[in-house]
């Protein structure tokens, strides 16, 4: 009799703090925690459909800590935000939001790109690409002599890889027409290799480029060189030069 | 674009009464605690009071317990402080904020100046 | 109340240069530390936030560190934007309280 009034007693008057779990200062058998030793939060616990008071060193995820004189409590940051430093500045979004300037979007605004990765808005990346590298010696067939016309290659590379709204890469080679020097080769002489013979293998992602290689080029339209006389050789170099025939794939 | 706007600053002798509003906007203005801090004439910032979201707690600064009220309307996203018993050291600069553990988000300020 | 010293009060520095600010606690406040940056007849506007948590919009020049009761705030290179008055501010404890300024100024 004397404890079911001692329990009795206890429910009518919940400031009670003797037997409190943990952190608690003071609480109640049916509320939990009432108040909190220092520095720790209040927050409310969502047990069945009753809430029950507990003290924490941190509030949980999605709440957030403000010390006030007379309480610490836990308060929920916005419903999109996971982790929060208040109301005002997420810092973690729930899935499917992106965080932009503290807040919970769900779509990017313009000029802004979603990072799938770390949930973000991040700026669009543009593709930025270096100056060209001079031309290549010109080569036919590997060799820099003889009078054959052949193909001559310059690249640049790529500073800076778009992201994915960013513009694409324009294309990192160019390969023209030009007449090989007009001077015989030696017997069994090797000619230098061009720098396109030298390229290195593209990095991953990029494709191959779409040069064409010189057998390909040396049956395009030619007038053999033996039927011109030189004046007319004179003026075909000179429009050879001016025509630049660009091939790549763009990245 | 969050907004907050100062009225209600003055001259006004020793003594005497003033009641500073703070207009809200671009915000859920129930969701957040409000505040007051001022700035003395060439002086450091200084917090004055705070109330709750929801106006059911109020916090102030030792120097204006009993002397300044902090109140707010949720209906007009209005914020106010009622300042008695003005003395010379009130004369200042006083914001509106937000307050979050910081002041994320402040007014313009409007002067008070106490002098006779 | 805690009590904050900001030094030094002012500080001449050329645009270029590298700044540090330091804040000094009268108690432990653990990380509960913001700062302001104020500039004549305007409002302060918050930089930072739990001594190192840059708001966004503020630019990366800027950074915070310490904890417990010393913090500092530095101004990796300062641009003419940034001379004007800084103000750091604790909140683990009411009432919260600012520093008294450090007001940085061109040489």
């Known amino acids: 009799q004397n404890a079911s009034r001692g329990r009795r007693q206890r429910r009518m008057h919940p400031n009670v703090s003797q037997g409190c779990q943990g952190g608690c200062a003071t609480c109640s058998d049916y509320n939990g925690c009432l108040s909190c030793k220092p520095r720790l939060f209040f927050a409310l616990e969502r047990i069945g459909m009753k809430q029950i008071g507990v003290c924490l060193s941190s509030c949980p995820s999605g709440y957030y800590g403000t010390r006030y004189p007379d309480i610490n409590k836990c308060t929920k940051c916005k419903a999109d935000c996971d982790t929060c430093f208040n109301k005002n500045f997420c810092t973690k979004c729930k899935s499917g939001f992106y965080l932009h300037l503290g807040k919970c979007l769900d779509n990017c605004p313009e000029g802004l790109e979603a990072n799938n990765h770390t949930m973000e808005c991040v700026s669009i990346v543009h593709c930025e690409v270096s100056e060209w590298n001079p031309w290549s010696p010109c080569t036919k067939k590997g060799k820099t002599c003889g009078f054959k016309r052949g193909t001559e290659t310059r690249v640049r590379e790529i500073i800076q890889h778009p992201s994915a709204k960013g513009n694409l890469c324009p294309p990192t080679n160019e390969t023209r027409k030009c007449t090989v020097q007009r001077k015989k080769c030696q017997k069994g002489e090797r000619g230098k290799k061009g720098r396109e013979r030298k390229r290195k293998k593209p990095n991953k992602g990029e494709s191959k480029e779409a040069i064409p290689d010189s057998k390909s080029l040396e049956s395009s339209k030619e007038i053999p060189e033996q039927r011109e006389n030189k004046q007319q050789q004179k003026k075909r170099k000179v429009q050879d030069k001016q025509k630049s025939v660009s091939v790549s794939t763009v990245h | 674009e969050v907004q907050l706007v100062e009225s209600g600053g003055g001259v006004v002798q020793p003594g005497r009464s003033l009641r500073l509003s703070c207009a809200a906007s671009?915000?859920?203005?129930?969701?957040?605690?409000m505040a007051w801090v001022r700035q003395a004439p060439g002086k450091g910032l200084e917090w004055v009071a705070t109330?709750?979201?929801?106006?059911?707690?109020?916090y102030y600064r030792d120097s204006v317990k009993g002397r300044f009220t902090i109140s707010r309307d949720n209906s007009k996203n209005t914020l106010y402080l009622q300042m008695n018993s003005l003395r010379a050291e009130d004369t200042a600069v006083y914001y509106c904020a937000t307050h979050d553990k910081t002041f994320d988000y402040w007014g313009q300020g409007t002067m008070v100046t106490v002098s006779s | 109340d805690i009590q904050l010293t900001q030094s030094p009060s002012s500080l001449s520095a050329s645009v270029g240069d590298r700044v540090t600010i330091t804040c000094r606690a009268s108690?432990?406040?653990?990380?509960?530390l913001a700062w302001y940056q104020q500039k004549p007849g305007k409002a302060p506007k918050l930089l930072i936030y739990d001594v190192n948590s840059l708001i966004h919009g503020v630019p990366s020049r800027f950074s915070g560190s310490g904890s417990g009761t010393d913090f500092t705030l530095t101004i990796s290179s300062l641009q003419p934007e940034d001379f004007a008055t800084y103000y750091c501010q604790q909140y683990d404890n009411y009432p919260n309280t600012f520093g008294q300024g450090t007001k940085l100024e061109i040489k």
């Open positions: 671009g915000f859920t203005f129930s969701d957040y605690d």
């Open positions: 109330i709750i979201y929801d106006g059911s707690r109020t």
């Open positions: 108690e432990d406040i653990y990380s509960d």
